[in-house]
């Protein structure tokens, strides 16, 4: 059986043109589904806003490495998978489309919070 068949899919259609201050970020998602127009990084801010960013940009690559390192330092480590609940506020810079697809994106959190708007938390093994 495919895992999490009804998990929604987040897609980015354009990227932020501005560099977001690292201090405002809590986590990120890798978007790789072929059902999306392009691979992307979705940054989740501490205010639970989602921002699409270009994964080819050097600052984006640096930020996600920093978030990965920070994740390892936080206990317990949590891994968020996109859930069916949709956020009521719009993303900062783009339209995000949510479609049904298994494991379309994974969010990496730097905090110990067990909930996040629009996602369900699952503890990493």
């Amino acid at each position: 059986q495919p895992d999490a068949v009804n998990a929604p899919l987040t897609c980015c259609y354009s990227f932020t043109s501005k560099m977001i201050p690292m201090s405002r970020l809590e986590s990120y998602k890798r978007i790789t589904s072929s059902r999306c127009p392009k691979e992307a990084v979705v940054f989740v801010t501490k205010l639970k806003r989602e921002v699409c960013a270009d994964p080819k940009k050097e600052w984006v690559q640096t930020y996600i490495k920093n978030l990965d390192r920070n994740q390892m330092r936080s206990e317990p480590t949590t891994l968020f998978k996109t859930a069916s609940a949709l956020r009521s506020s719009a993303p900062l810079n783009v339209k995000l489309t949510r479609k049904s697809e298994a494991n379309a994106s994974t969010t990496f959190s730097t905090t110990t919070s067990s909930t996040s708007v629009g996602v369900t938390s699952v503890t990493v093994n």
Epitope: R30, S34, P37, K38, E39, D68, Q71, M72, L79
Partner: antibody, heavy 117, light 107 residues
Framework: QVQLVQSGAEVKKPGSSVKVSCKAS????????MHWVRQAPGQGLEWMGR????????KFDPKFQGRVTITADTSTSTAYMELSSLRSEDTAVYYC??????????WGQGTTVTVSS | DIQMTQSPSSLSASVGDRVTITCKAT??????LAWYQQKPGKAPKLLIS???SLETGVPSRFSGSGSGKDYTLTISSLQPEDFATYYC?????????FGGGTKVEIK
């Protein structure tokens, strides 16, 4: 549907060069990175390098630096890998793959390159 | 370069068995680990990225775990179509490197 279709098998002489192509459909190659991975007979996988087709920037495993050239033509959605100064140890299946994050979710079918005198 | 050591290099198992494959990096790769399945004459297929995240369409009997330098791929109940070679790969830093592979054979 993303598809990567590679050129056909090649037989080459030691010291010569080979150029393998990888045509993408269902994606815009300038939005991703195109990687090349090889696999010698009965052996494991070996990453060779990648290109950002949007600007031509490349990155290689130092083992292949100077001997491999990776190019891309965004107008035809095709990536190319050329390996020069071929030796028998270069006999392998060469795969193209896409992935901006460094892992590879779509792969070509592979191109067998045989180096033999 | 980061070296990836996979073990065992081969194993024999029966349908229904629980199978565990491990992968060890020479340095912390911060969960940037992928697992692939490869069948003879075919290109590798991505199963898991980010150490734990199952790709679309991959059966839930496959799971990934681990952190730091040590990672595990588990097949909870081996099916006939799972007999193949499995590779881990780190994508923390280039050059991206693969483990040597684990061939899962029929007992």
């Amino acid at each position: 549907q993303v598809q990567l279709v590679q050129s056909g098998a090649e037989v080459k002489k030691p010291g010569s060069s080979v150029k393998v192509s990888c045509k993408a459909s269902g994606l815009t190659i300038s939005d991703t990175y195109m990687h090349w991975v090889r696999q010698a007979p009965g052996q494991g996988l070996e990453w060779m390098g990648r290109i950002d087709p949007a600007n031509g920037n490349t990155k290689f495993d130092p083992k292949f630096q100077g001997r491999v050239t990776i190019t891309a033509d965004t107008s035809t959605s095709t990536a190319y890998m050329e390996l020069s100064s071929l030796r028998s140890e270069d006999t392998a299946v060469y795969y193209c793959a896409r992935g901006v994050f460094g892992f590879f979710d779509y792969w070509g079918q592979g191109t067998t390159v045989t180096v033999s005198s | 370069d980061i070296q990836m050591t996979q073990s065992p290099s081969s194993l024999s198992a029966s349908v229904g068995d629980r199978v565990t494959i491990t992968c060890k990096a020479t340095e912390d790769i911060y969960n940037r680990l992928a697992w692939y399945q490869q069948k003879p004459g075919k290109a590798p297929k991505l199963l898991i990225s980010g150490a734990t995240s199952l790709e679309t369409g991959v059966p839930s009997r496959f799971s990934g775990s681990g952190s730091g330098k040590d990672y595990t791929l588990t097949i909870s109940s081996l099916q006939p179509e799972d007999f193949a070679t499995y590779y881990c790969q780190q994508f923390w830093s280039a050059p991206y490197t693969f483990g040597g592979g684990t061939k899962v054979e029929i007992k």
